[in-house]
């Protein structure tokens, strides 16, 4: 079962697996949560009744009843792995840590003018894991503004320590705001010659990548096939780094491959979540348990379900056996990967899909698009909600995407006249307006959240954030679109899609069926000589044919410009407004999302 | 210290090609990357093209994918930009810069060269 809240003066005893420093305790639940085996654990404060030495401990701990037996103890806070949890989790945290000096190596020393210019530049550089920056009141006169950048095995500091006037906090690169550049190619035939950090078992190239990627250490990676000459080295991943951050050599050696950690990347691709089976090959390690199941579908089910279970082999029945019931062999290991990789022995592994949480929703693949048409298929934008508003009349009022499980993001101007969010009914997973009934479900609205520097779309801030009285559970038919990363501000969007209910010319009516429309981007310059009585500004992005005929139109407003970009659809506008519908040389205009991402954050995460 | 000097700037016609040069001295060998940024009249300071000098790798950001190579010549210390198909958009101050880290960021850059300009236009 999932437990979130933390337990005050509490010490879970025995099951330790490792003990790490972190600033806090919910950091400390979040290591856990990330660490391969660890189910619970046990924080210690800083405390006078507590010796010094043990402040800021975080033992991981691991337990096979997923429970262990509780200790009163000053100044301990435990708590539960957010493994057994179905909400999305992420390694992001944002957190300064005031008089705190977190210790590690020090690999890097400079002047900055603030702490978020230290925590910038830990960001942005390759190593670094964390920082400690000495502020201005600092008492050692040569010391002040001094940004420490810094790194460790683990990726956690080795000690932490209490400092007056210092500050320390982490890189930001798993919040995706790194400017680290990023090399997505595997590249075929190759190996790097550089340090090894570590290595473990892995069924493929792919696999071997995003361990990498969530590796502290690992900044790029050689796999070595399964027909690769040297017997005991098939299937190896070797996790690499180098004092540059690059390899320094490559060698060009048939049946390896080798790539980059995506630590930089990440925002968009799944990189904890292995979902691929793997015929005819056989997963080695501590088994778990036995139990009879159906497929190998059925199999990676019972190892998502069982919390400790990390992989699993699959021996189908033989015949007529067991009803048609083949085994299934939950499995798991200190590190998360396989000690073994066998292959020709008839079994079907694959990894459990209780990590694919830890990437977010949105990068899920959905189904793929129907190609030629206007009118859109169920679950084709699982993201695209109907807003509606129940006064005077029930009706279609805008549209709007879910970016996460108690937002919706839409436009500003389509609450002119909205007094109350009462009136207001959120319906997602719709493809046809018909479809809704006095007793089709739907989410009420608790809050409008509108730009405060919005006055009217044209004059630009046409966002508004709506929450949710409930939560969304995601299914194949709603869930949610990634927000674009401010690292892709340079992305060059080819695939872009508008979708709505709304009218498909200028005097017409909201349609029955949800429309869609490939469109074009144009660029702010191309756009502005559109409109010239207008000002587009950077935080407009605009869109549309030059001949015209395909556009978004009234009814349309507050919902997606959808583009996809390495196989993940990200929400890079919200339809705001324009001359007319589709006409020539008058292109749509849409609140440009990533210039926004900072407030969307700001707003969602907001206690 | 390392110097870096850009060449090969000027005037040319959208569809036109151009090919800069950055010749680099001192301490060079310390460095893990070097990369090509431009700055437009009144736009923030953008990446370009990225290479890892050791290994070689490249990285372009979008709108150059396709038009701009980046390449070295290690024996004369110079990296060069060849710029194929250029439009009016491209028209900005070049510089080369040289750090240790492969970044898009131009403050993970210790050295800049003085800038070449590239103007496109009919």
């Known amino acids: 079962e999932c437990v979130t809240q933390l337990l005050k003066d509490t010490c879970f005893e025995g099951g330790d697996i490792t003990t790490v420093f972190t600033p806090s305790a919910k950091y400390c639940q979040v290591v856990c949560t990330y660490h391969p085996r660890c189910l619970l654990f046990t924080f210690t404060a800083e405390s006078p009744s507590e010796d010094p030495t043990r402040w800021f401990t975080c033992v991981l701990k691991d337990s096979v009843t997923e429970t262990l037996p509780r200790v009163n103890r000053t100044a301990a806070i435990s708590g539960y792995s957010f493994k057994q949890c179905s909400h999305q989790i992420s390694a992001c945290n944002k957190d300064i840590y005031v008089d705190l000096d977190m210790k590690g190596i020090n690999y890097n020393s400079s002047v900055a003018k603030s702490a978020q210019e230290c925590q910038e530049r830990c960001t942005d550089d390759v190593h670094c894991h964390f920082f400690t920056y000495a502020t201005r009141q600092f008492p050692s006169l040569e010391h002040r503004n001094i940004c420490l950048l810094k790194h460790t095995q683990t990726g956690t500091p080795t000690r932490i320590t209490k400092l007056d006037k210092v500050v320390s906090g982490f890189s930001l690169k798993s919040c995706a705001l790194s400017n680290l550049a990023c090399i997505r190619d595997i590249f075929p035939n190759t190996v790097f010659a550089d340090s090894n950090i570590d290595s473990v078992m892995a069924p493929d190239a792919f696999v071997c990548g995003r361990i990498c990627t969530h590796h502290p250490g690992c900044l790029f990676f050689t796999f070595f096939s399964q027909e690769w000459p040297k017997e005991s080295q098939r299937n190896l991943c070797l996790l690499k780094t180098s004092e540059s951050g690059l390899p320094s050599t490559r060698i060009k050696k048939s049946k390896a491959l080798s790539g980059f950690s995506l630590q930089s990347c990440r925002h968009s691709i799944p990189v904890f979540c292995h979902s691929s089976f793997y015929h005819d090959t056989d997963f080695l390690g501590e088994e778990l348990d036995i139990v009879a199941a159906k497929s190998h579908e059925a199999c990676q089910k019972l190892c998502t379900n069982a919390v400790r279970c990390q992989f699993f082999t699959y021996t189908p029945a033989q015949a007529s056996c067991n009803e048609g019931k083949g085994k299934c062999y939950l499995k798991l290991s200190s590190n998360g990967s396989p000690t073994k990789i066998l292959h020709g022995r008839g079994g079907i592994s694959g990894y459990t899909l209780r990590l694919c949480k830890m990437d977010n929703e949105c990068t899920t693949k959905i189904k793929p698009r129907i190609v030629g048409g206007t009118a859109s298929v169920r679950g084709e934008w699982p993201w695209q909600v109907t807003l509606h508003t129940t006064s005077p009349t029930q009706r279609h009022l805008c549209g709007g995407s879910i970016i996460g499980n108690q937002w919706i993001l839409t436009a500003a101007h389509c609450f002119y006249g909205v007094e109350s969010p009462k009136i207001l009914r959120v319906y997602s997973g719709i493809l046809n307006q018909s479809e809704i009934k006095e007793d089709t479900s739907f989410f009420g609205v608790q809050e409008i959240i509108i730009h405060d520097q919005y006055k009217m779309a044209e004059s630009g801030y046409d966002i508004a954030l709506l929450k949710l009285e409930t939560t969304v559970n995601y299914t194949d038919s709603q869930r949610p679109i990634c927000l674009p990363s401010k690292g892709d501000r340079n992305v060059i969007y080819t695939d872009c899609w508008v979708t709505g209910w709304g009218y498909r010319k200028l005097r017409d009516k909201i349609q029955n069926t949800l429309q869609k429309a490939k469109i074009p981007l144009v660029t702010n310059e191309e756009c502005q000589k559109r409109y010239r009585g207008h000002k587009i500004t950077h935080k407009m992005i605009c869109a549309g044919y030059r001949e015209g005929g395909k556009d978004a139109c009234k009814g349309d407003s507050g919902g997606p410009l959808s583009c996809k970009h390495n196989e993940v659809w990200h929400l890079v506008g919200i339809t705001s407004w324009g001359e007319g519908c589709a006409q020539r040389e008058r292109p749509g205009v849409y609140t440009n999302v990533v210039e926004y991402v900072d407030w969307i954050l700001e707003k969602t995460q907001a206690v | 210290q390392v110097q870096l000097v850009e060449s090969g700037g000027g005037l040319v016609q959208p569809g036109g090609s151009l090919r800069l040069s950055c010749a680099a001295s001192?301490?060079?060998?310390?460095?893990?990357?070097m990369a090509w940024f431009r700055q437009a009249p009144g736009k923030e300071r953008e990446g370009v093209a990225l290479?890892?000098?050791?290994?070689?790798?490249?990285s372009y950001t979008d709108s150059v994918k396709g038009r701009f190579t980046i390449s070295q010549d290690n024996s004369k210390n110079t990296v060069y930009l060849q710029m194929n198909s250029l439009r009016a958009e491209d028209t900005a101050v070049y510089y080369c810069a040289a750090g240790t880290q492969f970044s898009w960021s131009p403050g993970s850059y210790n050295y800049w060269g003085q800038g070449t300009l590239v103007t496109v236009s009919s």
């Open positions: 290479i890892a000098t050791s290994s070689g790798f490249i």
């Open positions: 001192g301490y060079t060998y310390s460095m893990g990357a």
